[in-house]
């Protein structure tokens, strides 16, 4: 593993055999809203006379409070081995990210491999179309942008029903409408593996010159 | 989404030369941005990675060759300070495969640019 | 770092036939393992990410397994178009470091 050995300094502690966390899953892949578990374990013989609890850890923060973590003791001759149970019911795109436990041994840190945990769901808007007053038979613009994962994210174009493009856009895509005569609606379809999205309807308004 | 690199050419040895590349569509202070390079006939080699934050990591091997730097909201720069002939190579420039402000992350590629040629010879 | 070792260097089969290539991990890297594929010309393309998952859009009859330091492709149903080059890659990071590294490839030729 790439995880710290503990290293101490008195000659006594220098004989005692490396603790590590041991191998578990590595890259999670799942639906938004389904549940999770993963876990990690370690070893610790007998020779090891302090040892703090296992803390959880998501890009780099301590996870504290509400979040469903169980440990659990399992002592023999040798010496004790603990498992940290790690659960999230009906994962959102919030639970992407890397977690990792870490725990002190004689004063030493010792971290885990990393569990990177992907959600997947439907394409998410992070930029949508915008109503805007035109002026009669002038150019504008109109911008759509959705991420997943999964990837790629298409985008069609729809104006009063009616898709704009036969062939999809990668996400982001601008639509340059050469002009138009009367009011119209505006919107976008994102399309990933999981289905499809539709951004809000906007309202593109004909200026009125007095 | 897409990349484009950019700045390949034919130098000689020793000459610095630096890599530009180009993305349209990708917020690089969501993604990171790695360097690959492939040699005449062989196979992949990873330089480094620049991660969303800023942090740069590399290949044992690229520590002191190569430097990655973002340069702009658009623009990620590989500079390779001492180019010798093996330096010889299509360098690739890729998108890491998650968003997300993190300096570690599972970074498999996910968008590739079409490469520029650098060609090192006396 | 890790060192990916991927066989066969080559491999030859007919149209509808099935190949088999594998990676080798020189330390276990879990399942952070993708494959790619890479025509002349043209840049790498994802196949498989987290050793078994299929990247968009990438017909089924791909298919990766393995974990900690042994990793297969499999690809069946063999079609002209799949003669290309594929490579493996590691993806492990802790939380300190990333270690990223491409196997050496295999040129699939399909006959």
């Known amino acids: 593993a790439h995880t710290a050995a503990p290293q101490v300094t008195s000659t006594a502690s220098k004989l005692l055999p490396p603790v590590a966390f041991n191998h578990t899953i590595g890259h999670i892949v799942l639906s938004e809203h389904k549940n999770v578990k993963f876990n990690c374990s370690i070893n610790i013989p007998n020779t090891y006379q302090e040892t703090a609890g296992i803390s959880w850890w998501k890009d780099g923060k301590e996870l504290l409070g509400a979040h469903h973590s169980i440990t659990q003791f399992y002592p023999d001759e040798e010496g004790v081995s603990i498992i940290a149970l790690f659960s999230i019911a009906s994962v959102q795109r919030s639970d992407n990210g890397s977690y990792f436990c870490k725990m002190k041994v004689n004063n030493r840190e010792i971290v885990s491999d990393p569990i990177y945990v992907e959600v997947q769901g439907l394409p998410y808007f992070i930029k949508q179309p915008e109503s805007v007053n035109v002026t009669r038979n002038t150019a504008f613009n109109l911008t759509c942008q959705a991420v997943g994962p999964p990837e790629p994210v298409n985008i069609f174009w729809v104006q009063n029903s009616s898709r704009v493009n036969e062939k999809p856009e990668r996400s982001p895509s601008v639509l340059t409408v050469p002009g138009l005569t009367e009011t119209a609606v505006f919107s976008c379809e994102a399309h990933n593996d999981k289905g499809l999205t539709v951004s809000k309807g906007v309202h593109i308004n004909i200026k009125v010159i007095p | 989404q897409s990349l484009e690199e950019s700045g390949g050419r034919l130098v000689t040895p020793g000459t610095p030369l630096t890599l530009t590349c180009t993305v349209s569509?990708?917020?690089?202070?969501?993604?990171?941005l790695g360097w690959v390079r492939q040699a005449p006939g062989k196979g992949l080699e990873y330089i480094g990675i620049?991660?969303?934050?800023?942090?740069t990591y590399y290949a044992t091997w690229a520590k002191g060759r190569f430097t990655i730097s973002k340069t702009s909201s658009t623009t990620v720069d590989l500079k390779i300070t001492g180019p010798t002939t093996e330096d010889t190579a299509t360098y690739f420039c890729?998108?890491?495969?998650?968003?997300?402000?993190?300096?570690?992350?599972?970074?498999?590629?996910?968008?590739w640019g079409p490469g520029t040629l650098v060609t090192i010879s006396l | 770092d890790i060192v990916m070792t991927q066989t066969p260097a080559s491999v030859e089969a007919a149209v509808g036939g099935t190949v088999t290539i594998k990676c080798q991990a020189s330390?276990?890297?879990?399942?952070?393992l993708a494959w790619y594929q890479q025509k002349p010309g043209q840049p790498p393309k994802v196949l498989i990410y987290?050793?078994?998952h299929l990247a968009s859009g990438v017909p089924s009859r791909f298919k990766g397994s393995g974990s900690g330091t042994q990793f297969t492709l499999t690809i069946s149903d063999l079609e002209c178009a799949d003669a290309a080059t594929y490579y493996c890659?590691?993806?492990?990071?802790?939380?300190?470091?990333?270690?990223?590294?491409f196997g050496g490839g295999t040129e699939v030729v399909v006959r």
């Open positions: 890729a998108r890491g495969a998650y968003a997300g402000y993190v300096a570690f992350g599972p970074y498999y590629f996910h968008i």
């Open positions: 569509g990708i917020d690089l202070s969501s993604y990171a």
């Open positions: 620049i991660s969303s934050t800023g942090t």
């Open positions: 330390q276990s890297i879990s399942n952070f």
């Open positions: 987290a050793a078994s």
């Open positions: 890659q590691s993806y492990f990071y802790s939380s300190t470091s990333i270690y990223n590294a």
